[in-house]
Amino acid sequence: QAGPLPKPTLWAEPGSVISWGNSVTIWCQGTLEAREYRLDKEESPAPWDRQNPLEPKNKARFSIPSMTEDYAGRYRCYYRSPVGWSQPSDPLELVMTGAYSKPTLSALPSPLVTSGKSVTLLCQSRSPMDTFLLIKERAAHPLLHLRSEHGAQQHQAEFPMSPVTSVHGGTYRCFSSHGFSHYLLSHPSDPLELIVSGSLEDPRPSPTRSVSTAAGPEDQPLMPTGSVPHSGLRRHWE
């Protein structure tokens, strides 16, 4: 007897983090034997949509014309072949930005930092929020989360980095969010350029758990160090 059908691959274009009002296309890729594709959204009546495969039948397209809060969430897809339905795909988390006003991102003591020294990136929101995210441009896995304990609302989060190396240099933005839906983020902060000077061959930090933040073959881990921030937020790694 044949084993279970392989699970399809699910992805979003242009990406899974979409600004309010922008369009997004969700693709589900199965096999050439697929006869039908189905997309389910968590906490929505199933199926969210069904589509016939596009030639050569190994994938289907699901579309969102203009991103709103209602589309944010977790999706899975399946395909049906002559022998039955496939396993579900790995989940796709579709995140909408623009749900809240943008926070302010600053560097303490300065965005100009010498290699080996310390710097703290500070993300501040006008209204109290319970989750803050730091993103580095062109990062492979860019999300650094700070989430408050017990839903406590905070106006800011600190992302300390020490010791700073050349890999920490680059452009950062931050977002804020409420815990009731981590699929809804604020507008992005204005970009902050962190400039690291005085190093050619810096020692690289080697944390046990890291978030990769540089793109391509230069991928290096970025692990803010130091104590849990004063704001009462605990570090949460995605």
Partner: antibody, heavy 121, light 108 residues
Framework: EQSVEESGGDLVKPGASLTLTCAAS?????????MCWVRQAPGKGLEWIAC????????RWYASWPKGRFTISKTSSTTVTLQMTSLTAADTATYFC?????????????WGPGTLVTISS | ELDLTQTPASVSEPVGGTVTIKCQAS??????LAWYQQKPGQRPKLLIY???TLASGVPSRFSGSGSGTEFTLTVSDLECADVAAYYC??????????FGGGTEVEIK
Amino acid sequence: EQSVEESGGDLVKPGASLTLTCAASGFSFSSTYCMCWVRQAPGKGLEWIACIHGVSTNNRWYASWPKGRFTISKTSSTTVTLQMTSLTAADTATYFCARSDTDYEWGLSLWGPGTLVTISS
Amino acid sequence: ELDLTQTPASVSEPVGGTVTIKCQASESIGSRLAWYQQKPGQRPKLLIYKASTLASGVPSRFSGSGSGTEFTLTVSDLECADVAAYYCQCAGQSSTWAFGGGTEVEIK
């Protein structure tokens, strides 16, 4: 052959309500479509009213000018309605149903012939 | 609320001439702009989508350009069959499908 057709246009008095229906043929609604209503007063330009996503009934988009008087709804996998209340002479127009299509970057690729709504005492 | 300002309101050119219609958005809409042709007494017809892509069956005399807030529709080698009203439209960006005010094209 895919098509849409409007019905329900009528002559009604100011203050009345009216429901227009758009019936799709040759296709059924899915996430790759939105169904939209557009109107055109005599001798005037096109005016967008509302759109609804083919699968997500929570996602309805309205122009600001109807100020809650118009409601777009999906009543089946091939029909959409436009409920209009508190009608005035300014709502006299031909009302078009049109399909917004992901293949055309959400442009309105398929239009009905229109249905005439006249508001007069 | 997004506004689309279309100019001119009307234009008259001889057969074989070129008509240029501009559409300005009050905020950036990327390339989410469509152009429509509506002949007297008929339903509108999609001419161009994604700012510059011709819909199927549309002659190459029609062309669209622009992105962000400034867009242009050009009709070259004008024919009598091109007499119509032309409309620009934001196609769903920022949750609106708003139209411009329209341009009447006539033959001189």
